[in-house]
């Protein structure tokens, strides 16, 4: 028997600091966790003690916090490197930039491979990216060889900005043929390291023959067997196991995301290269972790153009951008109409000649506007103040629901106004009208959503049973502020980008903002 | 700067065994692995196999159906190629050859030649 | 094995000419595929990795492509000092391959 010791991360999202134990920035560094100085610090002591080891990345390194926002995935190149990292799948997240941001920054100067089998490149493109990433990489370990075949999520140009001459193939099919290769040629060992979420992991694991073990990421799943070291709840054991269709048992496992784990994974294999066991759990990177010296020195030395960008002019705002709490809780705030039409803008994806976006709704909960902005200092717009704004580091994503879901969200939103509670939303691409004269659940009198198949957008009422796709915030996709029917009701969830690089980008793109009150949202006559 | 210095040449009768050394400075030895290839009188370049410093986990040419052994020392950064049995037809250049991040030979050592000869 | 296969064998050319090097896996090889010089009496030198990432240190006149199993060293004006023997090696699995070789002389 051959043991293999696989280490995992998925969904770092720019955590290259240590952050706090809601992966928010570091407040007491006595309780922080995760962070590039402390994963290597285990990294290193795992491959001292242990033979045959793979450290692993299964995408969205990209996107997440101001690093990203300066060093535009140069950071990722770097320390990724240092760590010495042996494989990266692509994330949805690496496209962010465009194909351009993913070139430059990262595929020329990883010193790892980076893979993908289902992304297909055409025309121009094609020489371009030749070989800058691979299907798959057949890697020396030990006395063996192991294959590792990459994947990434076909959803890809909803959500990011891979461009129109990469083609996003269908997981399954696409990993197939590479996974026969592999085995022709006599590599009887394969994971399958990929970014398509939990869902698409398990299908795999169990569609595609060859596969071995699955290395996931993209919904930020949290396996644990036992105890969970802290406040994730986990969605299953780790491994997970499922059964594949040809009657193997095929070990399929995720870290939860923004390096807080570095997932364990120890795999035995026979001689002919079947899994005979698998176990571990991931390990959490708390401060009982020393940071390592070195790579602390040199985030150090990094962070240093981050205090710098942090004041320095986006653009600029000639009105007062109302984020306060007596505003944005209780009415239309201009701030949140600011956020939202940023939110929109950055989810721009003309993917289908009949939709002029394939997205136009945007909700944001008036409590997660922490600031307002005064224009009367020139007009001008830094990260610092947008950080005053947006302090939580979240992120805005997409997610799928039904018309009588949203229907609940916004009797939610006023079930109890008045009381300057947070769950009251601002709004884009959706007109609201609320009676408060009428009892708490039945208060929503009229709800407009602007269309997205048509050349012309227009407000149309609300469906039902129609499937919507709208932007919002983490929290809420989570269930924040009591919208516990979204978390629920979902049919589909994608994580975003963050939020204060989402509105930084869009006030750098419209250089002066101008924000109105315009009757997003409306009170009927007599009842406000 | 990068170096990788062999042994010396070496004659040997048919049967007997060989080893070469290859000495590693300008890097750290246990971070990259190193590959052995060797080029007979006129012939193409041949892979013979692969060691990673760090743990001494070798992978071999199955040509070579067991004659040949690859081992380090960490602690003097040296690499070495034992190649049993020896023939005629193995009379070659045998090199060592570092590899890089993706497995590319990117610094070789100044070749040993290995004369087999009753 | 994967066969690797050159194209031509020998090739004689003058200073300033550019001269294309072909060579052919017998299976896909992922884009890895790597170009080596040597000449007489000395090691190989490794010019080209991953099919067409230059080596630092190696002159731009040296470029590759190709993906697939067809793959190119082209040197776009030569020099004196690049007559030599070229050789291609796949790494996309074990064991790792070379070509024949291909002899760049003087005209």
């Known amino acids: 028997a051959w043991e293999l010791t696989i280490l995992h991360t998925n969904d770092v999202h720019s955590r290259l600091e240590q952050t706090s134990e809601d992966s928010s920035k570091c407040v007491n560094a006595s309780r922080c966790m995760g962070g590039v100085a402390r994963l290597f610090t285990k990294v290193q002591q795992i491959r001292r003690a242990e033979p045959n080891v793979l450290l692993l990345d299964a995408g969205d390194q990209y996107q997440g916090t101001i690093w990203f926002t300066v060093y535009k995935g140069a950071e990722v190149a770097h320390f990724m490197n240092a760590l010495r990292y042996d494989a990266m799948a692509l994330g949805n997240h690496e496209f962010d930039n465009g194909v351009e941001g993913l070139i430059e920054p990262l595929l020329k100067e990883a010193k790892f491979p980076i893979l993908s089998a289902n992304i297909k490149a055409k025309g121009p493109l094609a020489s371009q990216i030749s070989g800058l990433y691979l299907p798959y990489k057949v890697l020396p370990v030990g006395d063996e060889v192991v294959g590792i075949v990459g994947y990434t999520s076909k959803e890809t140009p909803f959500l990011s900005n891979p461009g129109t001459n990469l083609v996003f193939e269908d997981e399954i099919t696409a990993l197939q043929p590479e996974v026969d290769k592999l085995k022709t040629l006599n590599v009887n060992k394969i994971i399958a390291l990929g970014h398509s979420g939990f869902e698409m992991d398990k299908l795999i694991a169990q569609k595609v023959r060859g596969v071995d073990v699955v290395v996931g990421g993209h919904s930020n799943t949290f396996l644990y067997t036992g105890n969970p070291p802290s406040k994730e709840v986990p969605a299953g054991k780790y491994p997970f196991i499922v059964t594949s269709d040809d009657g193997r048992k095929v070990p399929v496992v995720q870290a939860y995301a923004f390096g807080k784990y570095l997932g364990y994974l120890k795999i035995e294999f026979d001689e002919r290269g079947n899994v005979i066991s698998s176990h571990g759990n991931p390990i959490l990177l708390n401060s009982s972790i020393p940071e390592d010296p070195s790579i602390k020195a040199d985030i150090n030395k990094w962070r240093i153009k981050l205090d710098n960008y942090s004041t320095q002019e986006l653009g600029k705002t000639i009105v007062y951008l109302d984020g306060s709490s007596q505003s944005c809780r209780f009415r239309e705030c201009n701030m949140g109409n600011l956020i939202c039409d940023a939110m929109i803008n950055n989810n721009l994806r003309h993917t289908d000649e009949m939709f002029w976006n394939h997205v136009s709704m945007c909700i944001l909960n008036g409590g997660g506007i922490r600031s307002p902005i005064d224009e009367r200092n020139n007009g001008t717009i830094t990260w610092e103040n947008l950080a005053a704004v947006l302090p939580f580091g979240g992120t805005f994503d997409l997610v799928q629901l039904k018309g009588s879901t949203l229907k609940k969200a916004f009797e939610h939103s006023v079930h109890r106004y008045g009381q300057s509670t947070g769950e009251f939303l601002q709004v884009g691409g959706i007109h609201v009208v609320y009676d408060l004269s009428r009892k708490p659940g039945d208060r929503v009198v009229k709800l407009d959503v602007l269309c997205t198949k048509c050349r012309v957008p227009s407000y149309d009422p609300l469906k039902m049973d129609e499937v919507y796709k709208v932007i919002l915030p983490n929290f809420l996709a989570n269930g924040g502020d009591g919208f516990q029917m979204i978390k629920d009701e979902l049919l589909r969830h994608d994580s975003g980008d963050q939020d204060i690089n989402v509105v930084s980008t869009y006030i750098s793109k419209m250089k002066v903002i101008y924000p109105a009150v315009e009757g997003r949202i409306k009170f009927s006559t007599g009842s406000h | 700067q990068v170096q990788l210095v062999q042994s010396g040449a070496e004659v040997k009768k048919p049967g007997a065994s060989v080893k070469v050394s290859c000495k590693a400075s300008?890097?750290?030895?246990?971070?990259?692995?190193m590959d052995w290839v060797r080029q007979a009188p006129g012939q193409r370049l041949e892979w013979m196999g692969d060691i990673n410093p760090n743990n001494g986990g070798t992978i071999y040419n199955q040509k070579f159906k067991g004659r040949v052994t690859i081992t380090r020392d960490t602690s003097a950064s040296t690499a070495y190629m034992e190649l049993s049995s020896l023939r005629s037809e193995d009379t070659a250049v045998y090199y060592c050859a570092r590899t890089n991040w993706d497995y590319a030979m990117d610094y070789w050592g100044q070749g040993t030649l290995v004369t087999v000869s009753s | 094995d994967i066969q690797m296969t050159q194209s031509p064998s020998s090739l004689s050319a003058s200073v300033g000419d550019r001269v294309t090097i072909t060579c052919k896996a017998s299976q896909d090889i992922n884009s890895q595929l790597s170009w080596y010089q040597q000449k007489p009496g000395k090691a190989p030198k490794l010019l080209i990795y991953?099919?067409?990432r230059l080596i630092d240190g190696v002159p731009s006149r040296f470029s590759g492509s190709g993906s697939g199993t067809d793959f190119t060293l082209t040197i776009s004006s030569l020099q004196p000092e690049d007559f030599a023997t070229y050789y291609c090696q796949q790494y996309d699995v074990f064991p790792r391959t070379f070509g024949q070789g291909t002899k760049l002389e003087i005209k």
């Open positions: 300008g890097y750290t030895f246990t971070d990259s692995n």
């Open positions: 991953r099919a067409n």
